[in-house]
């Protein structure tokens, strides 16, 4: 931003009213009036070029410093070419000197050279030669100097002529300020430019209405340079929640819009399934029946719990059930759906029911499932089971209602026994089997059916309460088809697979375990 100039003294604008002090009095500098463009202009001039050594002083009136630390002095003047005078005037000069003196009071007409300090010798860039002067075409020079730091209440400037032909048309004294500024939603006050050229005055800004320094952000600061320009912005303010930047101000979000934190982003339209927000909203409330999970951003639509798993089937396989389901048709607007499976068993005789989590085995933990199937095993025969599959999402915990579907299945048989050949000889086969422990209490006996392979007319049956049997009196080197079935009080359980076991040939005698 361009510096602002505060004028302390303006000779040209004063219209000859200032009454500056000349020394020696009545000699040297003289106030003159000319007409230019039908307007009177005033100037102080001196032109004692033929008279040898000169020491003519012109002192300004006392200038109140006020808040200035460094002043700038702009001079507009003409200087005549010494060669334009007869004989070149050996004592003629083409420069003059600029001085200043600080004081806390106005000395009036009491002029003392020793109190003045030289600022600089002022030399023209262009001198006015004879031909120009005759054609009334004078060359105007502009020079600027600065002084600082100033510390007293006021000051004088003085111009020393040492034998030049000079006309001083304008003396303007001013200091510079960094102007009041709005930047980055921060207000920086008008600030007096510092006096030391290398240093920059650090100025703290204040956030505009409804703007804040973001958490962890730097407070807004700017640097006011000597020339009145703002430099090096640091930090910024952001419009607070519920407000957005419009030009250099923070404006409340319009109804139906919101902004949930201090940020550079504009207000956003209220998302789906929210109620229309009032002006300046930091969030939009959810419609009835819709919710926000704690981790949901305010920009996300409000969501609701899912509907139940849509299709659910329970396929019984012996003492196992495969549960399969499909995702809810209504996801509630979320993708974080998980499923939980619970189990209830009912005894058909008594109609009594109870949970069965402890007695059954799931193919994977039944809570927080992401897949849409699970196998439940170790089910007891002649028992009715009801499985509940519940769908949940990130907002299900915010409501009491549950979204579930149930499927019932009756287990009418025990799991088929798993059969192994333990040993064999030329005339015998030793067979063992197992079924899941929860089912063993229901088994009364096991029935082992066996026959020669290819002989469909005759078969043999052995019953036992144990888990193994040796089948004797078999033919050597012969394949037998063996099946084991559990017998319960209610009838037959599921039969095992039909296994093919072969007795040893007479050459390979001995009881070999397989």
């Amino acid at each position: 931003a361009q510096g602002k100039e505060v004028v302390l003294l303006d000779f040209a604008a004063a219209g000859g009213e200032l009454g500056w002090l000349t020394h020696p009095y009545g000699k040297g500098w003289d106030l003159m009036q000319n007409i230019m463009n039908d307007m009177p202009i005033y100037m102080y001039s001196v032109c004692n070029v033929m008279s040898g050594d000169q020491d003519n002083w012109l002192r300004t009136n006392w200038v109140y410093r006020g808040e200035a630390e460094r002043i700038f002095i702009e001079l507009k003047f003409t200087v005549r070419d010494c060669n334009s005078f007869p004989g070149g005037a050996s004592s003629c000069k083409e420069t003059f000197n600029l001085y200043y003196a600080e004081s806390d009071l106005d000395y009036g007409t009491n002029f003392q050279k020793r109190l003045f300090t030289k600022i600089d010798t002022i030399a023209p860039d262009e001198i006015t030669v004879s031909s120009d002067f005759e054609a009334r075409h004078v060359k105007l020079n502009v020079e600027e100097r600065s002084v600082g730091p100033l510390t007293r209440k006021g000051f004088y400037l003085a111009f020393q002529d040492i034998g030049a032909c000079v006309a001083l048309l304008s003396v303007r004294v001013y200091y510079k300020k960094c102007p009041e500024l709005l930047q980055g939603l921060a207000h920086f006050p008008e600030t007096i430019a510092g006096s030391d050229a290398p240093s920059l005055a650090t100025v703290a800004g204040t956030c505009v209405d409804h703007a804040v320094v973001p958490p962890g952000g730097e407070e807004p600061r700017m640097h006011c340079a000597v020339d009145g320009e703002w430099l090096v912005p640091i930090g910024q303010c952001l419009c607070q929640a519920g407000y957005e930047k419009v030009e250099d101000a923070c404006q409340a979000c319009s109804p139906g819009f919101f902004k949930f934190e201090a940020s550079e982003s504009p207000c956003l339209e209220c998302p789906e399934h929210t109620l229309p927000s009032p002006e300046g909203a930091t969030s939009c409330e959810c419609e009835e029946g819709f919710f926000r999970a704690p981790q949901d951003p305010a920009s996300m639509p409000c969501t609701r719990p899912p509907s139940a798993p849509h299709y659910l089937t329970a396929v019984g396989m012996g003492a196992k059930v495969e549960l399969r389901w499909t995702p809810p048709q209504d996801s509630g607007g979320r993708e974080d759906i998980v499923y939980s499976v619970t189990c209830e068993q009912c005894w058909p005789e008594s109609g009594e029911c109870g949970p069965c989590e402890a007695s059954v085995r799931y193919s994977e933990p039944p809570h927080g499932l992401t897949r849409t199937s699970v196998t439940v095993s170790d089910l007891e025969p002649h028992m009715n089971y009801t499985f509940t599959v519940e769908a949940r999402n990130g907002v299900s915990g915010l409501v009491t209602s549950r979204s579930f579907r149930t499927a019932s299945v009756s287990i009418n048989q025990t799991e088929p026994p798993k059969v192994r050949l333990e040993g064999r000889s030329t005339t015998s086969l030793s067979v063992s089997w197992s079924i899941p422990p929860p089912q063993q209490s229901r088994v009364w006996k096991y029935e082992v059916t066996y026959r020669k392979k290819g002989d469909s007319n005759s078969y043999n049956v052995r019953r036992t309460e144990g888990f193994s049997v040796t089948l004797d009196d078999l033919a050597p080197d012969t394949t037998y088809l063996v099946q084991v079935q559990a017998l319960t009080q209610e009838g037959q359980g599921a039969g095992s697979k039909v296994h093919e076991f072969q007795t040893l040939s007479p050459e390979g005698s001995g009881n070999l375990a397989v």
Epitope: Y311, T326, P327, S373
Partner: antibody
Framework: EVQLVESGGGSVKPGGSLKLSCAAS????????MYWVRQTPEKRLEWVAT????????SYPDSVKGRFTISRDIAKNNLYLQMSSLKSEDTAMYYC???????????WGQGTLVTVSS | DIVLTQSHRSMSTSVGDRVNITCKAS??????VAWYQQKPGQSPKLLIF???TRHAGVPDRFTGSGSGTDFTLTISSVQAGDLALYYC?????????FGGGTKLEIK
């Protein structure tokens, strides 16, 4: 016995509107999701709309979203499909269907024909 | 949306033949596939759901198989009355989509 009977089909000009009805009987209407499925002249089956058992959830494919509205009248056991801004590609036989908790669409109505033509 | 592709628009078979009608899903639908039969002038009828479960009253010559993305409807011994359009449908994720249909013609 589950019965679904559609009505309300007919001929309409592009941009016109039509309301289809489906009278449901033989089951508890509020226990089931209900659907409209259409069959184009090329014999393609397309799902058109869904309404949940309680009526709070509806769903449509992009091809009809904003133009078709499914609704149900629990008192009358009626399912409706309000169709507006009809296009020639909406020409089809419209079926009302219902599912079971374990299987899709075991029950279909006889269909009602909608022809959109200028 | 899940796309179901029935590669044969029509198939010609003789009474007593075994016929396989196939359906391919564009993504995994587990076993959530149904098959429908539509005879001329009638509404579609559910035959199979969950890939292999027969709907009530469906003759056991109709069997379904498959999982993931590849599914088959098998008619073990085609009867004259089986002349119809057969559609597969995935009922795994919404929108529940249908295949383009396979027309079974009797030689």
């Amino acid at each position: 016995e589950v019965q679904l009977v559609e009505s309300g089909g007919g001929s309409v000009k592009p941009g016109g509107s039509l309301k289809l009805s489906c009278a449901a009987s033989g089951f508890t209407f509020t226990d089931h999701y209900m659907y409209w499925v259409r069959q184009t002249p090329e014999k393609r089956l397309e799902w058109v709309a869904t309404i949940s058992d309680g009526g709070s959830f509806t769903s449509y494919p992009d091809s009809v979203k904003g133009r078709f509205t499914i609704s149900r009248d629990i008192a009358k056991n009626n399912l409706y499909l309000q169709m507006s801004s009809l296009k020639s590609e909406d020409t089809a036989m419209y079926y009302c269907t219902r599912d079971e908790s374990d299987r899709p669409f075991p029950y279909w109505g006889q269909g009602t024909l909608v022809t959109v033509s200028s | 949306d899940i796309v179901l592709t029935q590669s044969h628009r029509s198939m010609s078979t003789s009474v007593g033949d075994r016929v396989n009608i196939t359906c391919k899903a564009s993504q995994d639908v587990t076993t959530a596939v149904a098959w429908y039969q539509q005879k001329p002038g009638q509404s579609p009828k559910l035959l199979i759901f969950w890939a292999s479960t027969r709907h009530a009253g469906v003759p056991d010559r109709f069997t379904g198989s498959g999982s993931g993305t590849d599914f088959t409807l098998t008619i073990s011994s085609v009867q004259a009355g089986d002349l119809a359009l057969y559609y597969c449908q995935q009922h795994y994720s919404t929108p529940y989509t249908f295949g383009g249909g396979t027309k079974l013609e009797i030689k």
